[in-house]
Interface confidence: medium
């Protein structure tokens, strides 16, 4: 699985579907302090 900063950030921001594609949804997480570059 992708474990770079961007991957983790995007997962936490609710941007990714199971296939890894970008999806638009209504999930708004709290800022749990995800990641960097």
């Amino acid at each position: 699985a992708c474990d770079t900063a961007t991957c983790v950030t995007h997962r936490l921001a609710g941007l990714l579907s199971r296939s890894g594609g970008v999806v638009k949804n209504n999930f708004v997480p709290t800022n749990v302090g995800s990641k960097a570059f």
């Epitope: 992708c2 770079t4 961007t6 995007h10 921001a13 609710g14 990714l16 970008v22 960097a36």
Partner: antibody, heavy 122, light 107 residues
Framework: EVQLVESGGGLVQPGGSLRLSCAAS????????ISWVRQAPGKGLEWVAE??????????HYAEAVKGRFTISRDNAKNSLYLQMNSLRAEDTAVYYC?????????????WGQGTLVTVSS | EIVLTQSPATLSLSPGERATLSCKAS??????VSWYQQKPGQAPRLLIY???NRYLGIPARFSGSGSGTDFTLTISSLEPEDFAVYYC?????????FGQGTKLEIK
Amino acid sequence: EVQLVESGGGLVQPGGSLRLSCAASGFTFSNYWISWVRQAPGKGLEWVAEIRSESDASATHYAEAVKGRFTISRDNAKNSLYLQMNSLRAEDTAVYYCAVYFDYGLAIQNYWGQGTLVTVSS
Amino acid sequence: EIVLTQSPATLSLSPGERATLSCKASKRVTTYVSWYQQKPGQAPRLLIYGASNRYLGIPARFSGSGSGTDFTLTISSLEPEDFAVYYCSQSYNYPYTFGQGTKLEIK
């Protein structure tokens, strides 16, 4: 307002050392992963190193070109990121940027500092 | 290491025209591609992340597409301030890598 301010650049001889700093403000520094990216004069962008958050044990990753010579570190109490550069080579001459990338709700945030120039020359 | 190849190296167009910039990855990177704009003496500015998501405050004339290994940045109608160097980057695998850049210049 998020701000990243790099310092510590300058002229150094081949084989010498230099320590860069990046002072962060406007966000909870300890929570975020942060990177150094460099750009040689007139050239493209090159990722250098990344350090993870305090909760991720400040784990690090490096580009192959700097592995064993450069060390990325952070001082969360000072909201500061560092890059210790040893055994410097002419090809390390570049503007060094610190950059942070994180989520805030559904909005991705990306910030870069203004850069600090490192010149390795005899 | 994943190599990103951008084309063309230089693109000469006039304001109002459409610009199409290409970025090809040597391995599959799903949608973990970003596009940056850089002007002389300035830090890079994020335009597109996740291959197709416009960053905050980026005008609608900028759009990104692609997945897997082939990615495209399109500027639908060039404004004078769009002439700059554009870089794609991948953050699917370490080390993060950037393309060599496409210089968009005024014809």
